[in-house]
């Protein structure tokens, strides 16, 4: 059996056939973050639940030390949602001779680390100014896209302020990836 | 032909091969909601268009009575967007001896119901405080992630306030799932 | 080998098997927008990077002149994020004899163009009122869903105000699609 037997009329050689059920996949869910030393000049990375509740890793996609490990090269859909919550933000107050202060903000970054490459690559970023007057606030940032990843790549989720992450429910803050 | 003939060098037995075009898939779009009886202590569920316009169900994925029915076990990507719109939110008014009142909020939950299990499972939640002063407001909440679902599971979308859902366009509020 | 050899017990004929690695896929990233003539009564379309950095097109999915070209009929997952940023928006100020003015808003639309059909089809829309008092603001709108597309369909991303799009980083504003 040759992979190209099923090529459409424009005659293209296919890669070997592959069953879907065995593809690397993971869905990780939020846990309470413990204070750790963060890398300088980098947003802190979240750590995750990988086997309880809705969380799972399968088919050689492993989770270790805040990272999802990519076990095989290919195109992956990668996604995350982080729900933030905070107390009142006074970003709209006029300070310093009438100049508005820099707004508070919340940011999520999905980052790829390749051991052979010195600098991490930011794959996805969601960033939002927060300017809520007179009350507590909460809101999610969702990200998702497809990337060509290499075996051995590592993925993590970084946030601008780990203390604002809502860790109370597995459906509010999560991180996942699957081979297409 | 054995599925594992195409196993990579780390030699793994694959599940049987499967054509992509026949996988269960659905994309449902918004319709105007009419007042109905909701389940007690649960956010109301939306009902959906399943065949007109952009909406479809295929390959044994069926829609009935607010639920998407999962016809076969496997890993599914499930997503929804709900666009909310409201007229004036007074959450920033200072009440009760200067204490701000609890902010208005909007919430979307994608819920799984398994007949053999008494309690529904919340798969995904997007929740956002709404604090808009002196004007109409509108905004979407988007959710999407991968879950291991079982044949017979049912999925629905619940919202905190059905009256705030923007039902006017099929591209603004939608719900879908597909087997990976 | 017949596709249906692997049919589950409910005996369904499958389409021919197909290797995943050869499916049409694209992930496009933001570039600085140059002023162009927009079609009347339609939001301006963004143009994109399709080969540098994280951007790619593969397996006959091509990008040309603001459009992603669908090379083969099937069900596609289509997604985009646009990050907007702007100066202070005074939409909450009470004007005109106490009437709040209509809020500023930001909108993203993923649009399908079919040459044989006169009107474009809006597949996805994310629209949000912006009412930030006394500071600059920035925020993303994310969209993603599955659609049945035909060979020759073209996809584009339209925005309500091209001058508010944050074009500074490839991870902030992007557009992609892949055959399921």
């Amino acid at each position: 059996l040759k992979g190209q037997e099923f090529a459409p009329s424009h005659q293209q050689v296919y890669a070997p056939l592959r069953a879907d059920g065995d593809k690397p996949r993971a869905h990780l869910t939020v846990v309470r973050q413990t204070p750790t030393q963060h890398l300088k000049n980098q947003f802190p990375a979240l750590h995750w639940e990988h086997e309880l509740g809705l969380a799972f890793t399968k088919n050689r996609m492993n989770y270790t030390n805040k990272f999802l490990l990519i076990p095989e090269s290919g195109d992956y859909f990668v996604y995350s949602q982080v729900t933030f919550r905070g107390m009142t933000s006074e970003c709209s107050e006029i300070r310093q001779a009438g100049r508005p202060n820099k707004p508070d903000s919340i940011t999520v970054v999905i980052t790829k680390v390749t051991d052979s490459y010195p600098e991490p690559t930011q794959l996805l970023m969601g960033t939002k100014s927060v300017c809520e007057v007179g009350s507590n606030w909460f809101q999610p940032i969702y990200l998702g896209a497809m990337f060509s990843l290499q075996e051995g790549d590592k993925l993590m989720v970084n946030v601008s302020d780990i203390s604002l992450v809502d860790y109370t429910k597995e459906d509010k803050t999560f991180f996942g990836a699957f081979l297409l | 032909l054995k599925g594992q003939e195409f196993a990579p060098s780390h030699q793994q037995v694959y599940a049987p091969l499967r054509a992509d075009g026949d996988k269960p898939r659905a994309h449902l779009t918004v319709v105007r909601q009419t007042p109905t009886q909701h389940l007690k202590n649960q956010f109301p569920a939306l009902h959906w268009e399943h065949e007109l316009g952009l909406a479809f169900t295929k390959n044994r994925m069926n829609y009935t009575n607010k639920f998407l029915l999962i016809p076969e076990s496997g890993d599914y990507f499930v997503y929804s967007q709900v666009t909310f719109r409201g007229m004036t939110s007074e959450c920033s008014e200072i009440r009760q001896a200067g204490r701000p009142n609890k902010p208005d909020s909007i919430t979307v939950v994608i819920t799984k119901v398994t007949d053999s299990y008494p309690e529904p499972t919340q798969l995904l939640m997007g929740t956002k405080s709404v604090c808009e002063v002196g004007s109409n407001w509108f905004q979407p909440i988007y959710l999407g992630a991968m879950f291991s679902l079982q044949e017979g599971d049912k999925l629905m979308v619940n919202v905190s306030d059905i009256s705030l859902v923007d039902y006017t366009k099929e591209d603004k509020t939608f719900f879908g799932a597909f087997l990976l | 080998l017949k596709g249906q050899e692997f049919a589950p017990s409910h005996q369904q004929v499958y389409a021919p098997l197909r290797a995943d690695g050869d499916k049409p896929r694209a992930h496009l990233t933001v570039v600085r927008q140059t002023p162009t003539q927009h079609l009347k009564n339609q939001f301006p379309a963004l143009h994109w990077e399709h080969e540098l950095g994280l951007a790619f097109t593969k397996n006959r999915m091509n990008y040309t002149n603001k459009f992603l070209l669908i090379p083969e009929s099937g069900d596609y997952f289509v997604y985009s994020q646009v990050t907007f940023r702007g100066m202070t928006s005074e939409c909450s100020e009470i004007r005109q004899a106490g009437r709040p003015n209509k809020p500023d808003s930001i909108t993203v639309v993923i649009t399908k163009v079919t040459d044989s059909y006169p009107e474009p089809t809006q597949l996805l829309m994310g629209t949000k009122s912006v009412c930030e008092v006394g500071s600059n603001w920035f925020q993303p709108i994310y969209l993603g869903a599955m659609f049945s597309l035909q060979e020759g369909d073209k996809l584009m991303v339209n925005v309500s105000d091209i001058s508010l799009v944050d074009y500074t980083k490839e991870d902030k504003t992007f557009f992609g699609a892949f055959l399921l």
């Epitope: - | 105007r32 909601q33 007042p35 109301p44 109409n136 705030l164 | 709040p100």
Partner: antibody
């Protein structure tokens, strides 16, 4: 089926108050806004405001601010509209109405005639 | 507040005839417009929502169109039961406001 049943007609003196009730059945009362609309004899419809039965939050038209109070009792699925300091031009049929969205009311009560006369 | 101006205020028509009622908003209301029918001594009845969507159970001879500031309700072939007063209502912004009404009478 959805039903809104209002209290009976009232005759009031100027300066008095009236409280109209609206009992809901056939749907989840706390899930949908309740609007109040009035119609003076031979005149058009005038929207007064709404109440969110779930939270008790209200929004009143400026014209009625300080004179109208909308409340609800979720234990008996009933909304109330109280109008104080009645004047002769408050003589009208008062309707409660609800719907699946804020923008249009699918279901209306039968109306309550309030007559203000000295 | 947004003003809703309905015209004409009354119209005489025959059974089987076509009637068009217009409603103009004082500012852009997108498609947030509803049309109601009211018969004497009865509560209003929703006909059209979101400018052009027909409420369930309403005959297809009723249709709505328009967006922005100009809207139209059309009754394509008047039936005896259609003689009533018709109101438009905007729901783009608070407070909701109604048009003054159009009375459709038998010619």
């Amino acid at each position: 089926q959805v039903q809104l049943v209002q209290s009976g007609a009232e005759v009031k003196k100027p300066g008095a108050s009236v409280k109209v009730s609206c009992k809901a059945s056939g749907y989840t009362f706390t899930g949908y806004y309740m609007h109040w609309v009035r119609q003076a004899p031979g005149q058009g419809l005038e929207w007064m405001g709404w109440i969110k039965p779930k939270s008790g939050g209200t929004n009143y038209v400026q014209k009625f601010q300080g004179r109208v109070t909308m409340t609800r009792d979720t234990s008996i699925n009933t909304a109330y509209m109280e109008l104080n300091n009645l004047k002769s031009d408050d003589t009208a049929v008062y309707y409660c109405a609800t719907g699946g969205s804020q923008d249009a009311s699918d279901f209306w009560g039968q109306g309550t005639m309030v007559t203000v006369s000295s | 507040d947004i003003q809703m101006t309905q015209s004409p205020s009354s119209v005489s028509a025959s059974v089987g005839g076509r009637v068009t009622i217009t409603c103009r908003a004082s500012q852009d209301i997108s498609i947030w417009l509803a049309w109601y029918q009211q018969k004497p001594g009865k509560a209003p009845n929703l006909l059209i929502y979101a400018a052009s969507s027909l409420q369930s159970g309403v005959p297809s001879r009723f249709s709505g169109s328009g967006s922005g500031t100009d809207f139209t309700l059309t009754i394509s072939s008047l039936q005896p039961e259609d003689f009533a007063t018709y109101y438009c209502q905007q729901a783009d912004s608070f407070p909701l406001t109604f048009g003054g009404g159009t009375k459709v009478e038998i010619k």
